[in-house]
Protein backbone atom coordinates (compact mmCIF):
# COMPACT_ATOMS: atom_id res chain seq x y z
CA UNK A 1 0.00 0.00 0.00
CA UNK A 2 1.46 3.33 -1.09
CA UNK A 3 2.11 5.86 1.67
CA UNK A 4 -0.04 8.79 0.62
CA UNK A 5 1.82 11.04 3.08
CA UNK A 6 4.80 11.30 0.76
CA UNK A 7 2.60 13.32 -1.61
CA UNK A 8 1.94 16.04 0.97
CA UNK A 9 3.96 19.15 0.03
CA UNK A 10 5.76 21.59 2.29
CA UNK A 11 3.28 23.77 4.11
CA UNK A 12 0.98 20.84 4.83
CA UNK A 13 0.94 17.81 7.11
CA UNK A 14 -0.39 14.33 6.59
CA UNK A 15 -3.56 14.09 8.68
CA UNK A 16 -3.91 10.48 9.85
CA UNK A 17 -7.27 11.35 11.42
CA UNK A 18 -8.58 12.15 7.95
CA UNK A 19 -7.39 9.20 5.85
CA UNK A 20 -3.96 10.65 5.21
CA UNK A 21 -5.33 13.80 3.60
CA UNK A 22 -2.85 16.66 3.27
CA UNK A 23 -4.04 19.41 5.60
CA UNK A 24 -2.57 22.93 5.65
CA UNK A 25 -0.38 23.76 8.61
CA UNK A 26 -2.41 25.57 11.30
CA UNK A 27 -1.64 29.24 12.06
CA UNK A 28 1.78 29.84 13.69
CA UNK A 29 3.17 26.55 12.43
CA UNK A 30 5.11 25.38 9.38
CA UNK A 31 6.53 22.38 7.55
CA UNK A 32 9.62 23.04 5.47
CA UNK A 33 9.66 19.64 3.75
CA UNK A 34 7.07 17.38 2.19
CA UNK A 35 5.68 14.22 3.75
CA UNK A 36 5.52 15.60 7.30
CA UNK A 37 3.07 14.09 9.78
CA UNK A 38 3.09 17.23 11.94
CA UNK A 39 3.87 20.90 11.51
CA UNK A 40 6.45 22.59 13.71
CA UNK A 41 5.56 25.57 15.92
CA UNK A 42 6.91 28.86 14.58
CA UNK A 43 9.70 30.52 16.51
CA UNK A 44 8.59 33.68 18.31
CA UNK A 45 10.98 36.62 18.37
CA UNK A 46 10.25 38.34 21.69
CA UNK A 47 12.09 40.41 24.26
CA UNK A 48 15.64 41.10 23.07
CA UNK A 49 14.83 39.25 19.84
CA UNK A 50 13.14 40.98 16.92
CA UNK A 51 11.65 39.41 13.80
CA UNK A 52 13.93 39.45 10.76
CA UNK A 53 11.68 37.19 8.67
CA UNK A 54 8.08 36.29 9.41
CA UNK A 55 7.05 32.66 9.75
CA UNK A 56 5.28 31.21 6.73
CA UNK A 57 3.57 27.85 6.20
CA UNK A 58 6.82 26.53 4.67
CA UNK A 59 9.57 28.24 6.71
CA UNK A 60 10.27 29.18 10.30
CA UNK A 61 10.56 32.76 11.50
CA UNK A 62 14.07 34.18 11.71
CA UNK A 63 15.11 36.38 14.62
CA UNK A 64 17.63 39.13 15.05
CA UNK A 65 18.68 41.02 18.19
CA UNK A 66 17.33 44.43 19.11
CA UNK A 67 19.63 47.46 19.11
CA UNK A 68 22.32 47.18 21.76
CA UNK A 69 22.75 43.43 21.30
CA UNK A 70 24.24 41.11 18.68
CA UNK A 71 23.47 37.54 17.66
CA UNK A 72 25.35 34.50 18.90
CA UNK A 73 24.86 30.83 18.13
CA UNK A 74 23.17 29.01 15.29
CA UNK A 75 20.19 30.91 13.87
CA UNK A 76 20.68 33.72 16.40
CA UNK A 77 19.74 31.59 19.40
CA UNK A 78 21.30 34.09 21.83
CA UNK A 79 21.63 37.86 22.12
CA UNK A 80 24.86 39.19 23.60
CA UNK A 81 25.18 42.74 24.88
CA UNK A 82 27.08 45.34 22.85
CA UNK A 83 29.51 47.57 24.70
CA UNK A 84 30.62 51.09 23.82
CA UNK A 85 33.93 51.81 22.18
CA UNK A 86 36.52 52.04 24.95
CA UNK A 87 34.92 49.11 26.79
CA UNK A 88 35.02 45.32 26.78
CA UNK A 89 32.40 42.76 27.69
CA UNK A 90 33.27 40.95 30.90
CA UNK A 91 31.38 38.29 32.82
CA UNK A 92 29.91 41.10 34.90
CA UNK A 93 28.93 43.38 32.02
CA UNK A 94 30.65 46.16 30.09
CA UNK A 95 33.78 47.60 31.72
CA UNK A 96 36.05 50.45 30.62
CA UNK A 97 39.38 49.49 29.09
CA UNK A 98 42.27 49.68 31.57
CA UNK A 99 44.92 52.35 31.02
CA UNK A 100 47.23 51.31 28.21
CA UNK A 101 44.55 49.35 26.36
CA UNK A 102 41.86 50.26 23.83
CA UNK A 103 38.87 48.87 21.94
CA UNK A 104 37.57 50.69 18.87
CA UNK A 105 34.59 48.34 18.40
CA UNK A 106 31.35 47.43 20.17
CA UNK A 107 32.54 43.84 20.54
CA UNK A 108 35.78 42.12 21.47
CA UNK A 109 38.33 42.79 24.15
CA UNK A 110 40.56 45.72 25.05
CA UNK A 111 43.96 45.36 23.37
CA UNK A 112 47.27 46.93 24.43
CA UNK A 113 48.40 50.10 22.73
CA UNK A 114 51.09 49.62 20.09
CA UNK A 115 54.58 49.96 21.55
CA UNK A 116 56.10 52.41 19.07
CA UNK A 117 59.60 52.04 20.48
CA UNK A 118 59.72 48.37 19.44
CA UNK A 119 59.77 49.60 15.84
CA UNK A 120 62.22 52.37 16.68
CA UNK A 121 59.49 54.97 16.35
CA UNK A 122 58.07 57.65 18.62
CA UNK A 123 54.48 58.30 19.73
CA UNK A 124 52.91 60.87 17.43
CA UNK A 125 49.40 60.74 18.91
CA UNK A 126 48.69 59.36 22.38
CA UNK A 127 46.35 56.42 22.74
CA UNK A 128 42.96 56.55 24.42
CA UNK A 129 40.47 53.91 25.60
CA UNK A 130 38.91 54.05 22.13
CA UNK A 131 41.97 54.48 19.91
CA UNK A 132 45.43 53.02 19.53
CA UNK A 133 48.49 55.28 19.65
CA UNK A 134 49.75 56.64 16.35
CA UNK A 135 53.44 56.02 15.82
CA UNK A 136 55.55 58.63 14.04
CA UNK A 137 59.11 58.92 12.84
CA UNK A 138 61.92 57.57 14.95
CA UNK A 139 63.30 59.92 17.62
CA UNK A 140 66.54 60.19 15.60
CA UNK A 141 64.60 61.55 12.62
CA UNK A 142 63.19 64.30 14.84
CA UNK A 143 66.52 65.37 16.37
CA UNK A 144 67.84 68.89 15.50
CA UNK A 145 69.77 68.96 12.22
CA UNK A 146 68.24 65.72 11.05
CA UNK A 147 65.74 67.41 8.72
CA UNK A 148 66.87 68.97 5.45
CA UNK A 149 66.04 72.53 4.46
CA UNK A 150 64.03 71.42 1.43
CA UNK A 151 61.00 69.21 1.88
CA UNK A 152 60.96 65.91 0.00
CA UNK A 153 59.41 65.97 -3.48
CA UNK A 154 55.84 64.67 -3.56
CA UNK A 155 55.46 61.12 -4.78
CA UNK A 156 54.24 60.91 -8.38
CA UNK A 157 51.27 58.82 -9.34
CA UNK A 158 52.23 56.06 -11.80
CA UNK A 159 51.77 57.10 -15.41
CA UNK A 160 51.83 60.83 -14.68
CA UNK A 161 54.70 63.02 -15.89
CA UNK A 162 55.94 65.85 -13.70
CA UNK A 163 54.15 69.18 -14.15
Amino acid sequence: LQDLCSNCPAGTFCDNNRSQICSPCPPNSFSSAGGQRTCDICRQCKGVFKTRKECSSTSNAECDCISGYHCLGAECSMCEQDCKQGQELTKKGCKDCCFGTFNDQKRGICRPWTNCSLDGKSVLVNGTKERDVVCGPSPADLSPGASSATPPAPAREPGHSPQ
Epitope: E88, T90, K91, K95
Partner: nanobody, 124 residues
Framework: EVQLLESGGGLVQPGGSLRLSCAAS????????MSWVRQAPEKGLEWVSA????????YYADSVKGRFTISRDNSKNTLYLQMDSLKAEDTAVYYC?????????????????WGQGTTVTVSS
Protein backbone atom coordinates in the same frame (compact mmCIF):
# COMPACT_ATOMS: atom_id res chain seq x y z
CA GLU B 1 33.42 18.39 16.21
CA VAL B 2 33.11 20.17 19.56
CA GLN B 3 29.66 19.64 21.05
CA LEU B 4 27.91 20.61 24.29
CA LEU B 5 24.51 19.17 25.15
CA GLU B 6 22.54 20.47 28.14
CA SER B 7 19.78 18.62 29.97
CA GLY B 8 17.86 18.77 33.26
CA GLY B 9 15.73 21.85 32.70
CA GLY B 10 12.03 21.93 33.52
CA LEU B 11 9.27 23.55 35.51
CA VAL B 12 9.86 23.97 39.24
CA GLN B 13 8.14 25.90 42.02
CA PRO B 14 9.83 28.83 43.79
CA GLY B 15 12.13 27.51 46.50
CA GLY B 16 12.65 24.25 44.62
CA SER B 17 15.78 22.69 43.14
CA LEU B 18 17.04 21.50 39.77
CA ARG B 19 20.30 19.99 38.57
CA LEU B 20 21.48 20.81 35.07
CA SER B 21 23.99 18.66 33.19
CA CYS B 22 26.13 19.40 30.17
CA ALA B 23 27.70 16.52 28.24
CA ALA B 24 30.82 17.59 26.33
CA SER B 25 32.51 15.89 23.39
CA UNK B 26 35.07 16.61 20.68
CA UNK B 27 37.74 18.21 22.88
CA UNK B 28 39.91 17.44 25.92
CA UNK B 29 37.33 18.41 28.54
CA UNK B 30 39.69 18.68 31.51
CA UNK B 31 41.92 21.17 29.65
CA UNK B 32 39.27 23.88 29.55
CA UNK B 33 37.36 26.01 32.00
CA MET B 34 33.59 25.90 31.59
CA SER B 35 30.81 28.39 32.30
CA TRP B 36 27.05 28.44 32.69
CA VAL B 37 25.33 31.41 31.05
CA ARG B 38 21.61 32.16 30.93
CA GLN B 39 19.21 34.22 28.87
CA ALA B 40 15.98 35.33 30.51
CA PRO B 41 12.97 35.93 28.24
CA GLU B 42 13.33 39.72 28.13
CA LYS B 43 17.10 40.04 28.64
CA GLY B 44 20.45 39.44 27.02
CA LEU B 45 22.96 36.82 28.10
CA GLU B 46 23.96 36.80 31.77
CA TRP B 47 26.99 34.88 33.03
CA VAL B 48 26.07 32.63 35.95
CA SER B 49 29.07 30.59 37.05
CA ALA B 50 32.48 29.28 35.95
CA UNK B 51 34.82 26.46 36.92
CA UNK B 52 38.47 25.85 36.06
CA UNK B 53 39.57 22.83 34.02
CA UNK B 54 40.65 20.87 37.07
CA UNK B 55 37.61 21.92 39.06
CA UNK B 56 39.61 23.57 41.84
CA UNK B 57 38.41 27.13 41.24
CA UNK B 58 34.77 28.20 41.01
CA TYR B 59 33.18 31.61 40.48
CA TYR B 60 29.59 32.88 40.71
CA ALA B 61 27.55 35.90 39.72
CA ASP B 62 26.30 37.83 42.74
CA SER B 63 22.70 37.01 41.77
CA VAL B 64 23.21 33.24 42.34
CA LYS B 65 25.94 33.15 44.99
CA GLY B 66 25.01 30.83 47.88
CA ARG B 67 22.18 29.22 45.90
CA PHE B 68 23.89 27.65 42.86
CA THR B 69 26.82 25.21 42.83
CA ILE B 70 28.92 24.46 39.75
CA SER B 71 30.88 21.21 39.49
CA ARG B 72 32.39 18.91 36.90
CA ASP B 73 33.25 15.25 36.47
CA ASN B 74 36.19 15.09 34.09
CA SER B 75 36.03 11.29 33.91
CA LYS B 76 32.51 11.64 32.45
CA ASN B 77 33.18 14.81 30.42
CA THR B 78 30.21 16.40 32.16
CA LEU B 79 29.54 19.81 33.70
CA TYR B 80 26.83 20.33 36.35
CA LEU B 81 24.88 23.19 37.87
CA GLN B 82 23.00 22.47 41.09
CA MET B 83 20.34 25.14 41.51
CA ASP B 84 18.67 25.48 44.93
CA SER B 85 16.27 28.04 46.43
CA LEU B 86 15.10 28.89 42.93
CA LYS B 87 13.34 32.22 42.31
CA ALA B 88 11.05 33.43 39.54
CA GLU B 89 13.90 35.61 38.24
CA ASP B 90 15.99 32.47 37.60
CA THR B 91 13.60 31.59 34.74
CA ALA B 92 15.74 31.47 31.61
CA VAL B 93 17.35 29.29 28.97
CA TYR B 94 20.60 27.98 30.49
CA TYR B 95 23.60 27.39 28.24
CA CYS B 96 26.86 25.70 29.07
CA UNK B 97 29.87 27.21 27.37
CA UNK B 98 33.48 26.19 26.85
CA UNK B 99 36.08 28.81 27.69
CA UNK B 100 39.28 29.27 25.73
CA UNK B 101 41.69 28.58 28.61
CA UNK B 102 42.25 26.09 31.44
CA UNK B 103 42.02 28.67 34.20
CA UNK B 104 39.16 31.12 34.60
CA UNK B 105 37.93 34.01 36.74
CA UNK B 106 34.83 36.12 37.23
CA UNK B 107 36.00 38.81 34.80
CA UNK B 108 37.32 37.67 31.44
CA UNK B 109 34.58 36.77 29.00
CA UNK B 110 36.14 34.24 26.64
CA UNK B 111 33.49 31.64 25.87
CA UNK B 112 34.08 30.15 22.43
CA UNK B 113 31.63 27.22 22.13
CA TRP B 114 28.00 27.14 23.29
CA GLY B 115 25.43 24.40 23.78
CA GLN B 116 21.84 24.48 22.54
CA GLY B 117 20.42 25.39 25.95
CA THR B 118 17.90 23.93 28.38
CA THR B 119 14.86 25.86 29.63
CA VAL B 120 14.29 26.43 33.34
CA THR B 121 10.91 27.84 34.39
CA VAL B 122 10.36 28.82 38.02
CA SER B 123 6.66 29.38 38.64
CA SER B 124 3.95 28.50 41.13
Amino acid sequence: EVQLLESGGGLVQPGGSLRLSCAASGFTFSSYAMSWVRQAPEKGLEWVSAISGGGGSTYYADSVKGRFTISRDNSKNTLYLQMDSLKAEDTAVYYCAKEGTTETDDYHYNMDVWGQGTTVTVSS
